[in-house]
């Protein structure tokens, strides 16, 4: 779980902790500004009680009529109704709609392409390092190391299919056992969920949108982490995945099938291959300890090559090293044998931007990483804007009702399972869970899909990506068929087990609650989203990796106390909220801990100090650019600051938000105003001249 933001008192508590709740008027506050006042202001103060904390959310004390931030926003249609339009208006509106649809599809196309290029960029930057992770011999004996290697490699190459294909090739060539491969597959499952979390970061501009988007993205993370938390120990103890999949593989006489259909790649490849083309075999070769591969570039230069097989005479130290006894001879001094050598003749160069630059992989990767993130961000902003303008009024109502409404009683429970099937089907079509979940993220952000509905869709996506892997396995060559199929089935049954753990019973849907909690923290402290990303996808795996390299004793020596502390904190929180009377007075709340250990506020101050300087410069630059642009387009009205500058200005006014711990996991209520959300329409004026 994410670190706690604010840990309040447990109830009942004789020494009630009281804090001033500033700015709480029964009337609706001005929405054009955040009203974050500090505790020492002379505003009317309402004494509020800090209740026990159940989740990782920070709450605001507010009037009784509350606005649940998790409720989907009502997208008001400010335009003229269809019936009120004249023929010209209707035609214009129709063509506007068509134009918007084309634009939406266009941006969606470039969004998917940028995800593909982002993956390539990550492979260029960290692919070789990822390959070297695999060449670690301890993977065989240490499942925890296997898990973190799976996470790190998938994060570095931004593609679970790349990491699983490396695992498959290693199993096929007996460098890895299926038993050792299972934790890596589990790790790959976790690693692949970083993509949509990165996409969610792009929606940081609007707090309300960001809360939903980030929670919607991290629901995938939490599902994967929790599944691993439960299923990895179970697998280590029972080897159930290995046994089940082995039985399946052995009981069926599989024939080599067709390749999984590349539906989305057919459309995106013509564009992405003009940007960059990679030789992904290099990563696999590094993973398989091929020394020559370490000096090879991942950037593909030659696309058309002619392979000529020839036999050459080579000397060998002894006759035992001969290819075969019949292909062994001597010249009287040395022993000779005949080796098959493949000569690769380059015929035609690839047609992509970087083919003639001969830049190092890191340089190409960095360029592509920046560009793909910019395109990703731009496309996402435009998709959200277009969807925002399209999904208004009646259209939004219909779509939201269709997606989020359950089947009538008594079949309501079936809706989620249908969503799982839809998620699986859609992922199968687009051939990538990253693409599907990343496309889902902005829809959650703008409030078209609820997190409760996004959750089964994401779970379905996890299943969909494994069915693709199963089909790909069936198309493998003879020697790799068994291993690749077994690994694909392990992946499949791991996700099925995870769904059985965290979906059927509503009470067990912990990922939703955890994601909402994280969404709340990240909406208030937006830096925490990046912190979460670094901690969960880099620091924790790297720490475990480092400790594993140091040996079992070190790993256990450090790991056991850490796990013990986490369990202790969780048990203490549970007792504080459920039955605080059994605890000594001191432990009924978290006040015995220093503030920095129970609140993110001190950390926020530190982060703000670090980022303040950069933010100021950024905004100054932003203002200069903006004003120059306004002068050029002769539009004085359009010169408004960006959201980051508004936040900075408001922060400088020195306002703060009084906090209150949540009473339950569910029904978390945070007022939009107190959380500092400003509707997009209020903060931006459209430039008519542009």
């Amino acid at each position: 779980m994410a670190p706690w933001p604010e840990l309040g008192d447990a109830q009942p508590n004789p020494d009630k902790y009281l804090e001033g709740a500033a700015g709480q008027q029964p009337t609706a506050p001005d929405k054009s500004k955040e009203t974050n006042k500090t505790d020492n202001t002379e505003a009317p103060v309402t004494k509020i009680e800090l209740l026990p904390s159940y989740s990782t959310a920070t709450l605001i004390d507010e009037p009784t009529e509350v606005d649940d931030p998790w409720n989907l926003p009502t997208l008001q249609d400010s335009g003229i109704k269809w019936s009120e339009r004249d023929t010209k208006g209707k035609i214009l509106c129709f063509f506007q709609g068509i134009g918007r649809l084309i634009l939406l599809l266009g941006f969606l196309y470039f969004f998917v392409c940028s995800l593909d290029i982002l993956s390539s960029a990550f492979q260029l930057v960290g692919g070789k390092m990822a390959g070297q992770f695999f060449s670690n011999s301890s993977i065989m004996s240490n499942p925890l190391l296997g898990l973190v290697i799976g996470v790190l490699v998938t994060v570095l190459v931004q593609s679970s299919s790349t990491s699983t294909s490396i695992v498959v090739s290693m199993v096929s060539s007996s460098l890895l056992t299926v038993r050792a491969a299972i934790p890596i597959i589990m790790g790959a499952n976790i690693g692949t969920s970083i993509t949509n979390t990165i996409v969610a970061l792009m929606q940081v501009g609007d707090r309300s949108e960001f809360r939903r988007a980030f929670a919607g993205a991290t629901v995938h993370d939490f599902f994967n982490w929790l599944s691993v938390l439960v299923l990895l120990p179970v697998e280590v103890a029972t080897h159930y995945l290995e046994i089940i999949t082995q039985l399946i593989v052995e009981s069926f006489h599989f024939k080599n099938g067709e390749d999984a259909p590349d539906l989305l790649k057919v459309i995106t490849k013509p564009f992405t291959k003009l940007i960059v083309q990679l030789d992904k075999k290099v990563i696999s070769q590094i993973a398989m300890n091929d020394e020559k591969a370490k000096n090879k570039s991942l950037v593909k230069i030659w696309c058309k090559t002619f392979t000529n097989k020839t036999q050459i005479n080579v000397t060998v130290p002894s006759t035992a090293n001969c290819t075969s006894p019949s292909l062994c001879w001597t010249d009287g001094i040395q022993n000779w044998t005949m080796k098959n050598v493949t000569y690769k003749e380059n015929i035609a160069k690839c047609q992509h931007i970087f083919v003639n630059f001969h830049l190092p992989d890191l340089a190409v990767g960095t360029i592509l990483l920046i560009l793909s993130l910019l395109v990703l961000c731009g496309c996402l902003i435009m998709i959200v804007k277009i969807l925002g303008s399209v999904l208004k009024g009646q259209v939004a109502t219909v779509i939201k009702k269709t997606i989020n409404t359950d089947f009538p009683f008594p079949f309501a429970w079936l809706t989620g399972y249908l969503a799982i099937l839809v998620g699986a089907g859609m992922t199968f079509i687009v051939q990538s869970s990253s693409v599907f979940t990343s496309a889902l993220t902005p829809l959650i952000g703008i409030g078209v899909i609820t997190i409760e509905r996004a959750y089964p869709l994401t779970l379905g996506s996890n299943i969909g990506t494994t069915t693709t892997a199963i089909l790909a396995a069936l198309a493998s060559p003879g020697n790799a068929l068994r291993s690749s199929l077994q690994i694909a089935l392990c992946h499949f049954f791991f996700n099925i087990s995870g769904i059985l753990l965290w979906y059927p019973i509503p009470f067990t849907r912990l990922p939703i609650r955890m994601a909402k909690g994280l969404g709340n923290i990240s909406a208030k402290y937006r830096w925490f989203a990046v912190f979460y990303l670094i901690i969960f996808f880099f620091l924790i795996p790297l720490t475990v990796f480092g400790l594993s390299l140091a040996g079992w004793r070190v790993l256990v020596g450090v790991g056991v106390p850490v796990v013990f502390i986490i369990i202790l904190v969780l048990c203490l929180r549970l007792l504080q909220s459920r039955c605080p009377r059994v605890l000594p007075k001191k432990l009924q709340n978290w006040n015995f801990l220093p503030l920095w250990m129970r609140s993110l506020k001190p950390w926020d101050a530190v982060v703000s100090k670090f980022t303040g300087c950069f933010q100021m410069r950024c905004c100054c630059c932003c203002r200069v650019c903006c004003r120059a642009c306004c002068l050029l387009c002769d539009c004085p009205k359009c010169c408004r600051c960006s959201k980051c500058c508004e936040d900075l200005e408001e922060a400088q006014e020195g306002q703060d938000v009084p906090v209150k711990a949540p009473e339950t996991f569910d029904n978390i209520t945070i007022s939009r105003e107190a959380q500092g959300e400003v509707p997009a329409s209020d903060s931006k004026t459209e430039c008519t001249a542009l």
């Epitope: 006759t319 006894p325 062994c328 001879w329 001597t330 010249d331 009287g332 001094i333 040395q334 022993n335």
Partner: antibody, heavy 120, light 107 residues
């Protein structure tokens, strides 16, 4: 043309040593292996060992190991074969033979042979 | 060491006859076999290497075949100048070994 010229006939007493020389011409001396093959009167051919003049690497027949020594002098393009602790059964014609068919043990150029007689 | 057993040890044939000499290796030598001709009082001369490759200047009536352990040297049409002792040799393993030789005579 390739020519291998060997030293003259030798008569030795048992227990003594003999050093036969073989001077090569007509090809790049250091490139090809030089073999030594002996043939006892009315008998078949017997391979004694080989030397690679380029590096001086040698390989001997286990039967002669410890008794035979092959050396070369690149300045004179000459190969030497010394056989010690001579016995009467060492009486034979000693041939030096060059293998210009690269990477094979088939010898295509032969010296005229040196008759070594071991007699008390 | 690999033993090379040649048969027959001697043979007599008429001019124009097809003559076949066989050589058997004690273990697999692949195709690393050479054939030599040694005329009386002369030095050996390479005829064939790699089982079947004729050395430069060797007449086409000489041919070789076989692989593994069984090898054959064939003189398709015996000529008076072919009177000699023929040796097979393996160069699959050190030490290189020769067959006992086959003496060919004209009837």
């Amino acid at each position: 043309q390739v020519q291998l010229v060997q030293s003259g006939a030798e008569v030795k007493k048992p227990g003594a040593s003999v050093k036969v020389s073989c001077k090569a011409s007509g090809y790049t001396f250091i490139t090809y292996n030089m073999h030594w093959v002996r043939q006892a009167p009315g008998q078949g051919l017997e391979w004694m060992g080989a030397i690679y003049p380029g590096s001086g690497d040698t390989s001997y027949n286990q039967k002669f190991k410890g008794r035979v020594t092959m050396t070369r002098d690149t300045s004179t393009s000459t190969v030497y074969m010394e056989l010690s602790s001579l016995r009467s059964e060492d009486t034979a014609v000693y041939y030096c033979a060059s293998s210009t068919i690269i990477t094979t043990g088939a010898v295509d150029y032969w010296g005229q042979g040196t008759l070594v007689t071991v007699s008390s | 060491d690999i033993q090379m057993t040649q048969s027959p040890s001697s043979l007599s044939a008429s001019v124009g006859d097809r003559v076949t000499i066989t050589c058997k290796a004690s273990q697999d030598v692949g195709t690393a076999v050479a054939w030599y001709q040694q005329k009386p009082g002369k030095v050996p001369k390479l005829l064939i290497y790699w089982t079947s490759t004729r050395h430069t200047g060797v007449p086409s009536r000489f041919s070789g075949s076989g692989s593994g352990t069984d090898f054959t040297l064939t003189i398709s049409s015996l000529q008076p100048e072919d009177v000699a002792t023929y040796y097979c040799q393996q160069y699959s393993r050190i030490p290189l070994t020769f067959g006992g030789g086959t003496k060919v005579e004209i009837k």
